[in-house]
């Protein structure tokens, strides 16, 4: 199996976009419905 970094979000592999969950620490709201930071 090819190695992927899970925190990268998505990577190009054989010209195909492969997506992985991002680390919750990415602070960008990758998790649907999870409150991130404060109200900005």
């Amino acid at each position: 199996d090819a190695e992927f970094r899970h925190d990268s979000g998505y990577e190009v592999h054989h010209q195909k976009l492969v997506f992985f969950a991002e680390d919750v620490g990415s602070n960008k709201g990758a998790i649907i419905g999870l409150m991130v930071g404060g109200v900005v």
Epitope: H6, V18, F20, A21, G29, A30, I32, L34, V36
Partner: antibody, heavy 112, light 111 residues
């Protein structure tokens, strides 16, 4: 009150397009990813895709790659989802989500 | 696609009693980083869904601690220690190891 406010219900004919909006109220929508999901009548949830408002990067579930187009207008703190070539099977409630906030849902009905 | 399968599809419960919902994924959601990419959502009648549990066993903000989740790489359980009337609705498990996919939902209603 912090919320995401979506545009109202739409009725469209097959083959038409529709653009659903999602505006941040008391919330800067351009800071976090905006996710879009749909819920078919009496059915479960499907993730359509998401957009990073900072750079416009999008990622879609493959089945929606040619169906949905996600955009954000950071000047008005509004996210948009445009659906093209509508079919009766696209009749659903569509939700936007950003951080911990969900829109109220927009019912799109496709009927001739 | 990773397929999420829930059981039961309907779960009549008694207030004050415990309840549980099962969810199975077609592929292990345990990543080598040690995190399990399994989520639980609740959609109360007439409302938008809300996040209950993230990454298998983390309670989302504001969610009562009567909710808990556990599991292995492919088999998961959401438990409510003592059901309250406000817990009725449709519960969905979901994964985001590869994109996002959801289970078909389990309707929890009061007996």
């Amino acid at each position: 009150q912090v919320q995401l406010v979506q545009s109202g219900a739409e009725v469209k004919e097959p083959g038409a397009s529709v653009k659903v909006s999602c505006k941040g109220s008391g919330f800067n929508i351009h800071v976090y990813y905006v996710h879009w999901l749909r819920q078919l009548p009496e059915k479960g949830l499907e993730w359509i895709g998401r957009i990073d408002p900072e750079n416009g990067e999008t990622i879609y579930t493959p089945k929606f790659q040619d169906k949905a187009t996600l955009t954000v207008d950071t000047s008005t703190d509004t996210a948009y989802m445009e659906l093209s070539s509508l079919r009766s099977e696209d009749t659903a409630v569509y939700y936007c989500v950003s951080s911990g906030y969900w829109g109220q849902g927009t019912l799109v009905t496709v009927s001739s | 696609d990773i397929v999420m399968t829930q059981s039961p599809l309907s779960n009549p419960v008694t207030p004050g009693e415990p309840a549980s919902i099962s969810c199975r994924s077609s592929k292990s959601l345990l990543h080598r980083n040690g995190k399990t990419y399994l989520y639980w959502y609740l959609q109360k009648p007439g409302q938008s869904p809300q996040l209950l549990i993230y990454q298998m066993d983390h309670l989302a903000s504001g969610v009562p601690d009567r909710f808990s989740s556990s599991g292995s790489g492919t088999d998961f359980t959401l438990k409510i220690s003592r059901v309250e009337a406000e817990d009725v609705g449709v519960y969905y498990c979901a994964q985001n190891l590869e994109l996002w996919t959801f289970g078909q939902g389990t309707k929890v209603e009061i007996k």
